[in-house]
């Protein structure tokens, strides 16, 4: 029986060319974590496997940087990126869990003061 | 003027399909979410899902992954959501909503779009 | 799913009264930048809802200064100074901070 749940950032209002963290959280579950994927749509942004570390998609390697810890971070973002997100636990011997994320990137001048942030 | 104009009300068969448009004007199309909304009975309301007209991603509620289907067309600035396999439990009126930028409510409504499944 | 519980579900009032919406979520609606995305809605009968207040306590444009919004964390009120006529009909909110979406279950404003 599946007894864990996600907790995410929660959706994100931030500004073009600047940078945003998702992270999600698995609790209430002593399952092993074997494999989380980052997914935006149907392309996979990164992989961070338990025994191998971190993928990042080469499409992505530029704007993407693995952490903090399971999370992700997205750099240098732009309109496009606005979408949703998802990060998707494997795990034994429980299954999979998934958390979503909405990340909406707006032009400067929109976006909220909250969301101005760049990774130190 | 923000405006949002949906398509008339209908009725249709149980298992059949059908599509409901939303037409934009008064606002830059792309520049915002257009959300969708389920009003059932007893004055219930539920978030189906929202298109980002920009680059065409969705999000679903994953209630109606299956049932919905959300689509754009940017050149008339039209949004579209498409009803699958029409049963009772889908009679309802439906709304499109604009996302208000930066804050995740909704900030224009359509008019709704009343749907009736019957035989 | 995030659950958000409106109460009461009906509220008798009288024209000029002052009453208060209580909506409650199951977890905090608080991003991890700190912003809240919780808004509420009038629905008045064969119309469309009507935005009145987003990101807990921002009016939106044209809406009276009766209506005010407070709250944070999983605690939210909407308050209306002085109910008007027009003020009737079905009051929701709607958290926005967790995927998906999810409405409270409405507060009918009435006359007593």
């Known amino acids: 029986m599946m007894t864990g749940t996600i907790e995410t950032t929660g959706n994100i209002s931030a500004e073009k060319g600047g940078s945003i963290i998702l992270q999600c959280h698995l609790s209430s579950t002593t399952a092993q974590v074997t494999q989380v994927n980052w997914e935006q749509q149907d392309q996979l942004l990164a992989i961070c496997n338990a025994d191998l570390g971190w993928h990042i998609s080469p499409s992505f390697k530029d704007r993407v940087a693995p952490g903090p810890g399971l999370g992700l971070t997205l750099q240098s973002l732009t309109v496009n990126d606005t979408g949703e997100y998802f990060c998707i636990y494997h795990t034994y011997p429980d299954g999979t869990y998934t958390g979503r994320i909405f990340l909406e990137v707006l032009e400067s001048s929109v976006a909220e003061h909250g969301a101005r942030f760049q990774i130190p | 003027e923000v405006q949002l104009q949906q398509s008339g009300p209908e009725l249709v068969k149980p298992g059949a399909s059908m599509k409901i448009s939303c037409k934009a004007s008064?606002?830059?199309?792309?520049?915002?979410?257009m959300n969708w909304v389920k009003q059932s009975h007893g004055d219930n309301l539920e978030w189906i899902g929202l298109i980002v007209p920009y680059n065409g991603g969705t999000s679903y509620n994953l209630k109606f992954k299956g049932k919905a289907t959300l689509t754009v067309d940017k050149s008339s600035s039209t949004a579209y959501m498409e009803l699958l396999s029409l049963t009772s439990e889908d009679s309802a009126v439906y709304y499109c909503?604009?996302?208000?930028?930066?804050?995740?409510?909704?900030?224009?409504w359509g008019q709704g779009t009343s749907v009736t499944v019957s035989s | 799913d995030v659950v958000v519980t409106q109460t009461p579900l009906s509220l008798p009032v009288s024209f000029g009264d002052q009453v208060s919406i209580s909506c409650r979520s199951s977890q905090s609606l608080a991003n991890s930048y700190g912003n809240t995305y919780l808004s509420w809605y009038l629905h008045k009968p064969g119309q469309s809802p009507q935005l009145l207040i987003y990101g807990i306590s921002n009016r939106f444009s044209g809406v009276p200064d009766r209506f005010s919004g407070s709250g944070s964390g999983t605690d939210f009120t909407l308050k209306i100074s002085t109910i008007k006529p027009e003020d009737l009909g079905m009051y929701y909110c709607?958290?926005?901070?967790?995927?998906?979406?999810?409405f409270g279950g409405g507060t009918k404003l009435e006359i007593k």
């Open positions: 709607l958290q926005g901070t967790h995927q998906p979406p999810t």
């Open positions: 008064g606002y830059s199309f792309t520049g915002y979410t």
């Open positions: 909503a604009r996302g208000l930028q930066r804050f995740y409510a909704m900030d224009y």
